[in-house]
Amino acid sequence: ELSPQPSNEVNLLDSKTIQGELGWISYPSHGWEEISGVDEHYTPIRTYQVCNVMDHSQNNWLRTNWVPRNSAQKIYVELKFTLRDCNSIPLVLGTCKETFNLYYMESDDHGVKFREHQFTKIDTIAADESFTQMDLGDRILKLNTEIREVGPVNKKGFYLAFQDVGACVALVSVRVYFKKCPFTVKNLAMFPDTVPMDSQSLVEVRGSCVNNSKEEDPPRMYCSTEGEWLVPIGKCTCNAGYEERGFICQACRPGFYKASDGAAKCAKCPPHSSTQEDGSMNCRCENNYFRAEKDPPSMACARPPSAPRNVISNINETSVILDWSWPLDTGGRKDITFNIICKKCGWNVRQCEPCSPNVRFLPRQLGLTNTTVTVTDLLAHTNYTFEIDAVNGVSELSSPPRQYAAVSITTNQAAPSPVMTIKKDRTSRNSISLSWQEPEHPNGIILDYEVKYYQKQEQETSYTILRARGTNVTISSLKPDTTYVFQIRARTAAGYGTNSRKFEFETSPDSFSISGENSHV
């Protein structure tokens, strides 16, 4: 399989990529010979070979064309070659060698004539595995790769030369390269191609943040002589509206947002909000939905609550207790409170005015968190309308109408106190006559009394109510010889008082009558 060249290597010469003849200088002319061959992948290439193994004192030179240095300070020479085992060649004992020599010469000029003595030896090259005649069937195993480094190089370019001293060798490819720290992105910072120094020191390189990001700490890295980036320091982070994807900051897609700079990912828009464009820092609320000023962008958009329900008023003289149920729709928020608007009205409900400041609300008029309020210090015999507003954190952002429930009441004096004693005047088999005294505190004109009775053994599962104008009553159609329980309460314009305690009386067993008994429970 073809192994790609590392990205940190920059070729100055690669014989495999040259189309046609290489045209290098061979001296003497019957030494190195340019031939067509194949590489380890059976790709046709131009190679140089020499196999003058019969003669002693071979000195065959092959010089490359001039190679420009570019920005390299240290260069690497990669040789791929095949070297034939001397034992596989008949007749040549003593004259055959299994090494060759690598030289170089720096030059600012590329028209230099070839002179051996101007070249500096880099190394003697020997095969890691030379191959014998029996190896020739499988070409891939015959290839040797040797790499040598040269440097520092200072002039504009250089020549390489190969000296054969009697080996049977083919140069399959010659690659000359230098190492650079390649363009890279680390921690969202871009670091440019950087050529390292020849010395052992590292080159410090300042990174620049990728698009749509900003420095968190100044990004830096060090370029080593081997063309490797080392010790990343600092970083960039994506701006609001952008998230890290691979090596870039990518805009949040429609429907997603990112509120602040940093490493967080784009988040889905919260309920009842959306974005139509890329790169959103927050999501816009849908129509009739709102976000309060101090709400974070991650909070769902909400709407005002619906009106409170099931308002009940309990009037006591010039006070009223108002109770209600929570709105069916909270609007999507938990911060619901209730405000009470108090209006004093004439006998025509449409003619109302705000209540006097003397009216008191317990625990308070505005910002109630529970569903009950007591209103006191109202005027007696007066019509009032109470509007109970349900509000939440976004109510003030929405246009009217308000969401409220209203209740109208009329104040009065207090209801009468209880009847204290009930007296049995007489009884028969089917009837009982009762009388009582007016309550101690009638609190007005008593309009009538409510008499409630039931058979004791039935435990109030079934009872009868009748009204009496005065302070006595005869109850008929009763069962003989039966105990009945009686309660009485008075009614005024203010309403019913509380019931008396329970009194028990019995009907007669026979047809005679009994009179003048009190009863105690």
Epitope: H30, V53, R84, I89, P90, L91, Q133, L136, G137
Partner: antibody, heavy 121, light 106 residues
Framework: QVQLLQSGAEVKKPGASVKVPCKAS????????MSWVRQAPGQGLEWMGW????????TYAQGFTGRFVFSLDTSVSTAYLQISSLKAEDTAVYYC??????????????WGQGTLVTVSS | EIVLTQSPATLSVSPGERATLSCRAS??????LPWYQQKPGQAPRLLIY???TRPTGIPDRFSASGSGTDFTLTISRVEPEDFAVYYC????????FGQGTKVEIK
């Protein structure tokens, strides 16, 4: 231009000897081995052996020992094949051929034009 | 001694056709196997060495392959000047030639 030049045809009597020269030009004579090949009329090629032109050391193939001798005169870049006690079955064209060793394999890359030796009484 | 057997002995082809010649060794000779071409009245000429490498000047219609004991010489499109006898040769301890394959005009 690399070439091997051989002498013209020879006619010999049985029992006689013949020395066939092969003069090399256009390259360093001692840098390549020299091979000898025989081809009887209407037959295929037969490798006779070779000589190391650097050391003068010969190698003979089976069937070509005894009466066949390879020799050199490096001063005139010439290789010789001498056959003694000629027999009728020695009648053939004799080729000298330069041996080429390469990394990928060997072969005889330059041939003389051949010398026809006829043995007839 | 290694014996090389070439087949067929004679191959009749028309110009422009493909010709495939076979050479089989009695034991493995790896890839050190050259091929030669010999025209009537001429010395042989080296066509291929190392089983598949062409010397300078040999047309690329000649190609060869194989290793071990089985080798093939292929002429992709036979030209008039290609009618000749073709020999394979092995380089063992002692060198030997095959008996040759004659390529003639059909």
């Amino acid at each position: 231009q690399v070439q091997l030049l051989q002498s013209g045809a020879e006619v010999k009597k049985p029992g006689a000897s013949v020395k066939v020269p092969c003069k090399a030009s256009g390259y360093t004579f001692t840098s390549r081995a020299m091979s000898w090949v025989r081809q009887a009329p209407g037959q295929g090629l037969e490798w006779m052996g070779w000589i190391n032109t650097n050391t003068g050391n010969p190698t003979y193939a089976q069937g070509f020992t005894g009466r066949f001798v390879f020799s050199l005169d490096t001063s005139v870049s010439t290789a010789y094949l001498q056959i003694s006690s000629l027999k009728a079955e020695d009648t053939a064209v004799y080729y000298c051929a330069r041996v080429r060793f390469t990394v990928y394999g060997d072969g005889m890359d330059v041939w003389g034009q051949g010398t026809l030796v006829t043995v007839s009484s | 001694e290694i014996v090389l057997t070439q087949s067929p002995a004679t191959l009749s082809v028309s110009p422009g056709e493909r010709a495939t010649l076979s050479c089989r060794a009695s034991q493995s000779v790896s890839s050190n196997l050259p091929w030669y071409q010999q025209k009537p009245g001429q010395a042989p000429r080296l066509l291929i060495y190392g089983a598949s490498t062409r010397p300078t000047g040999i047309p690329d219609r000649f190609s060869a392959s194989g290793s071990g004991t089985d080798f093939t010489l292929t002429i992709s499109r036979v030209e008039p000047e290609d009618f000749a006898v073709y020999y394979c040769q092995q380089y063992g301890p002692s060198w030997t030639f095959g008996q040759g394959t004659k390529v003639e005009i059909k």
